[in-house]
């Protein structure tokens, strides 16, 4: 058993049929010595008396808010949460496996630039009685500071018969140099509590590997005389690291109709303009990627051909 | 300890092409190592990230773009002294700081070159003959060093008398390649910045 925060404790349980469970001793936070009784949750049934209460925690029915009283007055609370371990593996029931970029990916993180700011998100089908707490650091043995905000519900989607909820959090490395060469990864730890179930999820990454620039901005078209060709130009996104001659991007320019199966024109360039063939009912799209370290491409920025 | 903005003429920077080749060569070699050594811990997640140039050169700090010198997190107090006559300096007005930067890059390349050559000598003794260093990568390191053209003491190639542990050598190769790729990215960024300045 360990303390998650003040008066909230996590009991780690091997979860299998007829498991013996864990013996837990609760101590009432009071100078009083006698006349103390214990109850669980809203029940008035007295579970025991005395300054300490020893319980055998085997299942969720044994978890909850234990309260010690004296003469009708509440002295202190202890909330017990369960963390299940099945076949040596901690449970991951609360969050959905996003399966990208690989199986057992529960947390996904992205950074728009090298400033040390990044966003992580996760998915769940649970809508109520759910809380998250996020911590992060650079490295684990001698951790350096990363400050994370509160996790917030950022999107709701309908997936078949189920509703899916996306939560996200923003973090910022306390002293980040955009030009630095990372040797220690960022560690992100998310504590998830659903009712009386506790789970924790972690992700480890280098900022350079989670870079995904914003789409290029200010796409403009200029038809070329006596030709089917069009010159398309754009600018670096405002959120990208500067100077741009140091943090350079490369671009993919594509002309395509509404369907992905339609024919297309595609060209890659390090410049902020390109010449392509425009077709009726097609769109010109441009996306960006770090020129020197191939992490993710940005989303497309698009303009219609006509 | 940073790069001034008014430096060489655009397009007159002979090292840009070599640095692009360097990044390409080390990336290809790393990809080849990951594929060939698939049953060894050779991915970014599996290896320890070591920097053989740590406390010996200060390329990131010496080559910091002017715009980032206002960022206190970028200003590390490490100082290293370097020799300062390089042929990539395409203008006589080039400052001492830029010479320091390019000299630091040269020292990085020299250190990695020695490590890679030593390692290749060991790998050539491996009866499995599983992986060797790409001669193209070694040639590209050499070309960039020649383009930088700094006079510097030659570092003797390390020779070891004991029987090489090929498993450890291959893991060290992965560690070196990952670190060298990251340094090659920095070098490419620096050359691009100087070329645009």
């Amino acid at each position: 058993i360990w303390e998650l925060k003040k008066d909230v404790y996590v009991v780690e349980l091997d979860w299998y049929p007829d498991a013996p469970g864990e013996m837990v001793v609760l101590t009432c936070d009071t100078p009083e010595e006698d006349g103390i009784t214990w109850t669980l949750d809203q029940s008035s049934e007295v579970l025991g008396s005395g300054k300490t209460l020893t319980i055998q925690v085997k299942e969720f029915g044994d978890a909850g808010q234990y309260t010690c009283h004296k003469g009708g007055e509440v002295l202190s609370h202890s909330l017990l949460l369960l963390h299940k371990k099945e076949d040596g593996i901690w449970s991951t029931d609360i969050l959905k496996d996003q399966k990208e970029p690989k199986n057992k990916t529960f947390l996904r993180c992205e950074a728009k630039n090298y400033s040390g700011r990044f966003t992580c998100w996760w998915l769940t089908t649970i809508s109520t009685d759910l809380t998250f707490s996020v911590k992060s650091s650079r490295g684990s043995s001698d951790p350096q500071g990363v400050t994370c905000g509160a996790a917030t519900l950022s999107a709701e989607r309908v997936r078949g018969d189920n509703k899916e909820y996306e939560y996200s959090v923003e973090c910022q490395e306390d002293s980040a140099c955009p030009a630095a060469e990372e040797s220690l990864p960022i560690e992100v730890m998310v504590d998830a509590v659903h009712k009386l179930k506790y789970e924790n999820y972690t992700s480890s990454f280098f900022i350079r590997d989670i870079i995904k620039p914003d789409p290029p901005k200010n796409l403009q078209l200029k038809p070329l005389k006596n030709s089917r060709q069009v010159e398309v130009s754009w600018e670096y996104p405002d959120t990208w690291s500067t100077p741009h001659s140091y943090f350079s991007l490369t671009f993919c320019v594509q002309v395509q109709g509404k369907s992905k199966r339609e024919k297309k024109d595609r060209v890659f360039t390090d410049k902020t303009s390109a010449t392509v063939i425009c077709r009726k009912n097609a769109s010109i799209s441009v996306r960006a990627q770090d020129r020197y370290y191939s992490s993710s491409w940005s989303e497309w920025a698009s303009v219609p051909c006509s | 300890r940073n790069l001034p903005v008014a430096t060489p003429d655009p397009g007159m920077f002979p090292c840009l092409h070599h640095s692009q080749n360097l990044l390409r060569a080390v990336s290809n070699m790393l990809q080849k190592a990951r594929q060939t050594l698939e049953f060894y811990p050779c991915t970014s997640e599996e290896i320890d990230h070591e920097d053989i140039t740590k406390d010996k050169t200060s390329t990131v700090e010496a080559c910091l773009p002017l715009e980032l010198t206002k960022n206190e997190s970028c200003l590390n107090s490490r100082e290293t002294s370097f020799i300062t006559n390089g042929s990539c300096l395409a203008s006589r007005k080039t400052s001492f700081m830029m010479a320091l930067c390019l000299s630091s890059i040269y020292e990085d390349l020299k250190m990695y070159q020695v490590e890679f050559k030593t390692m290749n000598a060991k790998l050539l003794m491996d009866p499995k003959r599983q992986i060797f260093l790409d001669q193209n990568m070694l040639a590209v390191i050499d070309e960039l060093m020649q383009a930088l053209n700094f006079n510097s003491e030659t570092v003797p190639q390390k020779s070891s008398l004991e029987e090489p542990d090929f498993y450890k050598t291959k893991i060290k190769l992965c560690i070196l390649l990952h670190a060298f790729r990251i340094r090659a990215v920095t070098i490419d960024r620096v050359m691009s910045y100087l070329n645009a300045s």
Partner: antibody, heavy 118, light 107 residues
């Protein structure tokens, strides 16, 4: 299985024209760009131009501009390349090639030898 | 027009040995570079597109690398069926242009 089948070999006199056909089978004809590339004996490949069969849009290499005409007939899934004012240096194998991507070629015809000789 | 220069023009190789063909562009073409194989009397066959992207059905011994002006086609271990002429082609701008070809022959 997508195939491009070209017309047979031709012998032409200098100053005349030649029209080579390329019939596509497998896949929808208008879903692909169609190009013509030639290869003189013992020489490399030379791109001549492309057509979008969907709308008839064409683009030609400056070297052939004014001398080459590429057309397409959607009803028969056939593309044509006509080269006029032939000279002996136009002796080559002319091949059609196609792709959903405009700028490179994933399927080629077998080629048509055009010999220009007086 | 962008001029594509291949080297060597002729490459004698022992079967089972690796082979590398170089292609250089007269100006930077990013990764807009494609490789073809042509055997005598046959149409060219696309091997690699956009410098390094492999084609399904093409053996994994063929790989491409490069960007900017310098590109390489590598055959890791030459098989008897690989003896042919190889062409690079740029698609950075029209007109599309090819290299002169590299003939890989048995040593």
């Amino acid at each position: 299985q997508v195939q491009l089948v070209q017309s047979g070999a031709e012998v032409k006199k200098p100053g005349s024209s030649v029209k080579v056909s390329c019939k596509a089978s497998g896949g929808t004809f208008s879903d692909y760009y169609l190009h013509w590339v030639r290869q003189a004996p013992g020489q490399g490949l030379e791109w001549m131009g492309w057509i979008d069969p969907e709308n008839g849009d064409t683009e030609y290499a400056p070297k052939f501009q004014g001398r080459v005409t590429i057309t397409a007939d959607e009803s028969t899934s056939t593309a044509y390349m006509e080269l006029s004012s032939l000279r002996s240096e136009d002796t080559a194998v002319y091949a059609c090639a196609r792709n959903k991507e405009l700028r490179y070629f994933d399927v080629w015809g077998q080629g048509t030898l055009v010999t220009v000789s007086s | 027009d962008i001029v594509m220069t291949q080297s060597p023009l002729s490459l004698p190789v022992t079967p089972g040995e690796p082979a590398s063909i170089s292609c250089r562009a007269s100006q930077s073409i990013s990764i807009n570079l494609h490789w073809y194989q042509q055997k005598p009397g046959q149409a060219p066959r696309l091997l690699i597109y956009f410098a390094s992207q492999s084609i399904s059905g093409v053996p994994s011994r063929f790989s491409g690398s490069g960007s900017g002006t310098d590109f390489t086609l590598t055959i890791s271990s030459l098989q008897p069926e690989d003896f042919a002429t190889y062409y690079c082609q740029q698609s950075n701008s029209f007109p599309l242009t090819f290299g002169q070809g590299t003939k890989v022959e048995i040593k």
